[in-house]
């Protein structure tokens, strides 16, 4: 574990200038220790935190579940970023779990737009262009998200 | 989503001790730091003691080092709090929370969860 002084003037180096003149404040990828005179660096793959604050403790990596895929893996300073694995996708009104894309448009529909992580195929009337949005089915799987954070980005 | 379900308050003599339970549904627990809190008549609501999601990490309040030890099992989504040497002082109600994690003043960050507490008498 390495240690940080809390002296402002330690805290001047570029990689961790201080946003604020807010004193007891821990750069991101530390917390604070109990006694609040030290910064602690949080454990690699472990635990992370992303702004300077006043933890006690770092938050725990999200663990990608299955059904997902891995895009970044965590580090001290950010979290784990999962994405849906092909085929699936999650929204943003449902973040917690990756849904089945639709396999293809109804009858008199073209599909305009493949399926993504982030979003299902989209559907048009071939003659007007108007959007179709169909119900879909959502897949048995849950993410694991981490506390505090949005369910796992999709970028 | 996480809820939390406090047990084993009671009213005990002075010098004695309890041990608190906080029993976690959901399947998230451990990714949760977990804290405990306490509120005595017409006080403000106190920090007490809290630990990070593994339980590798703890925390006290200066008030209760030494007589009382936070612990966790993740295995049974559970949060203990063993109290010994019990004051007049500490009787309040117990809450346990969860959270990413909590500040040294005790502020939750990220979302938190609360139990509808214990209540822990110490009789001189």
């Known amino acids: 574990i390495t240690r940080q002084s809390l002296d402002p003037q330690r805290r001047a180096a570029p990689q961790q200038k201080r946003s604020s003149p807010t004193e007891g404040l821990c750069p991101p990828g530390h917390h604070i220790s109990e006694d609040s005179r030290e910064c602690i660096s949080c454990k690699y793959g472990q635990d992370y935190s992303t702004h300077w604050n006043d933890f006690l403790f770092c938050l725990r990596c999200t663990k990608c579940d299955s059904g997902e895929v891995e895009v970044n893996s965590c580090t001290t300073t950010r979290n784990t970023v999962c994405q849906c694995e092909e085929g699936t996708f999650r929204e943003e009104d449902s973040p917690e779990i990756c849904r089945k894309c639709r396999t293809g448009c109804p009858r008199g529909m073209v599909k305009v737009k493949d399926c993504t992580p982030w979003s299902d195929i989209e559907c048009v009337h071939k003659e007007s262009g108007t959007k179709h949005t169909g119900e879909v089915p959502a897949v048995e799987k849950t993410v694991t998200t981490s506390p505090g954070t949005p369910a796992s980005p999709c970028s | 989503e996480v809820q939390l379900v406090e047990s084993g308050g009671g009213l005990v003599q002075a010098g004695g001790s309890l041990r608190l339970s906080c029993a976690a549904s959901g399947r998230t627990f451990s990714n949760y730091a977990m804290g405990w809190f306490r509120q005595a008549p017409g006080k403000e609501r106190e920090f007490v003691a809290a630990?990070?999601?593994?339980?590798?990490?703890?925390y006290y309040v200066d008030s209760v080092k030494g007589r009382f030890t936070i612990s966790r099992d993740n295995a049974k989504n559970t949060v203990y709090l063993q109290m010994n040497s019990l004051k007049p002082e500490d009787t309040a109600v117990y809450y346990c929370?969860?959270?990413?994690?909590?500040?040294?003043?005790?502020?939750?960050?990220?979302?938190?969860?609360w139990g509808k507490g214990t209540l822990v008498t110490v009789s001189s």
């Open positions: 630990l990070n999601w593994s339980g590798g990490s703890t």
């Open positions: 929370a969860a959270a990413g994690s909590f500040s040294l003043g005790g502020r939750p960050y990220g979302d938190d969860y």
